[in-house]
């Protein structure tokens, strides 16, 4: 079953996906698509990386993490109800049938009437200690740094535990890390 993530209309949605490159800069192609992962490739591709950089993107979809270190988590900006559905993160490991496939379910909720306080986060990369804010409503938050190696079963269990008490997208502070090589 898919791991569920939630966002409100007008916010940014965050769908986590990670792998560990075999060596620094030794990147693996990744595709993100709308719809469950098919046998090969991604259907309805919204973003794609190659061994060096992002080589295909669409306007509201971008990578907010350090993709060169294997953080290929997808940000969908300014979501609408139409963005609800299953998204596929496919890590295209060389070799026959070696790809890692992750199906993530995005649930978009109508915006709350009462605006929540804007959250913020610090960057530590090229913009040292950079503050990020959303112009309307809460910002997406993301923890950059080491991520625990946990399997999808653990994530699913954690999602079930959190679903009733916290937003499922709080899972962004954990992520499935695929080691390559």
């Amino acid at each position: 079953s898919e791991v569920e993530y939630r966002a409100e209309v007008g916010q940014n949605a965050y769908l986590p996906c990670f792998y560990t490159p075999a060596a620094p800069g030794n990147l693996v192609p990744v595709c993100w698509g709308k719809g469950a992962c098919p046998v090969f490739e991604c259907g309805n591709v919204v973003l794609r990386t190659d061994e060096r950089d992002v080589n295909y993107w669409t306007s509201r979809y971008w990578l907010n993490g350090d993709f060169r270190k294997g953080d290929v988590s997808l940000t969908i900006e300014n979501v609408t109800l139409a963005d609800s559905g299953i998204y596929c993160c496919r890590i295209q490991i060389p070799g026959i049938m070696n790809d890692e496939k992750f199906n993530l379910k995005l649930v978009i909720k109508p915006a709350k009437v009462t605006p929540a306080p804007t959250r913020q986060r610090d960057f530590t990369a090229a913009f040292p200690r950079m503050l990020t804010t959303r112009g309307h409503g809460p910002a997406e938050t993301q923890t950059l740094g080491s991520l625990p190696d946990i399997n999808l079963t653990q994530i699913s269990t954690l999602a079930n535990e959190l679903r009733d008490s916290r937003l499922a997208n709080d899972l962004r502070d954990s992520g499935a890390t695929i080691r390559i090589g």
């Epitope: 509201r60 907010n64 993490g65 990369a125 959303r134």
Partner: nanobody
Framework: QVQLQESGGGLVQPGGSLRLSCAVS????????MGWFRQAPGKEREGVSC????????SYPDSVKGRFTISRDNAKNTVYLQMNSLKPEDTGVYYC??????????????YGKGTQVTVSS
């Protein structure tokens, strides 16, 4: 051909303000994350602001937070940097930049040629 053309730089006294503009051509701005970088003499280029494709998400380092504001007008293919309460350490060449499909922390695809900002009394 992608072109980013900065304007609005100049000499200003400490405490003063400037508004930089970046005219974008050759790409669809609302599909790009845009940023402003600066480079002082003898120093590395550093990011001073970043804005997402729709303008809904912005970022600033502590050194300019509360003083600089980035904005964009996709209909006019223009990105702006409003700089208030300028300090001598803000002096440098300011570059407009664009990146496809990812946030600006991890490098940019395109840079303009820059506009000089000098803060001095």
């Amino acid at each position: 051909q992608v072109q980013l053309q900065e304007s609005g730089g100049g000499l200003v006294q400490p405490g003063g303000s400037l508004r930089l503009s970046c005219a974008v051509s050759g790409l669809t701005p609302d599909a790009y994350v845009m940023g402003w970088f600066r480079q002082a003499p003898g120093k590395e280029r550093e990011g001073v602001s970043c804005i997402s494709p729709s303008g809904g998400t912005t970022s600033y380092p502590d050194s300019v937070k509360g003083r600089f504001t980035i904005s964009r007008d996709n209909a006019k293919n223009t990105v702006y940097l409003q700089m208030n309460s300028l300090k001598p350490e803000d002096t440098g060449v300011y570059y407009c930049a664009a990146v496809a499909g990812r946030w600006c922390d991890y490098g940019m695809n395109y840079y303009g040629k820059g506009t000089q900002v000098t803060v001095s009394s």
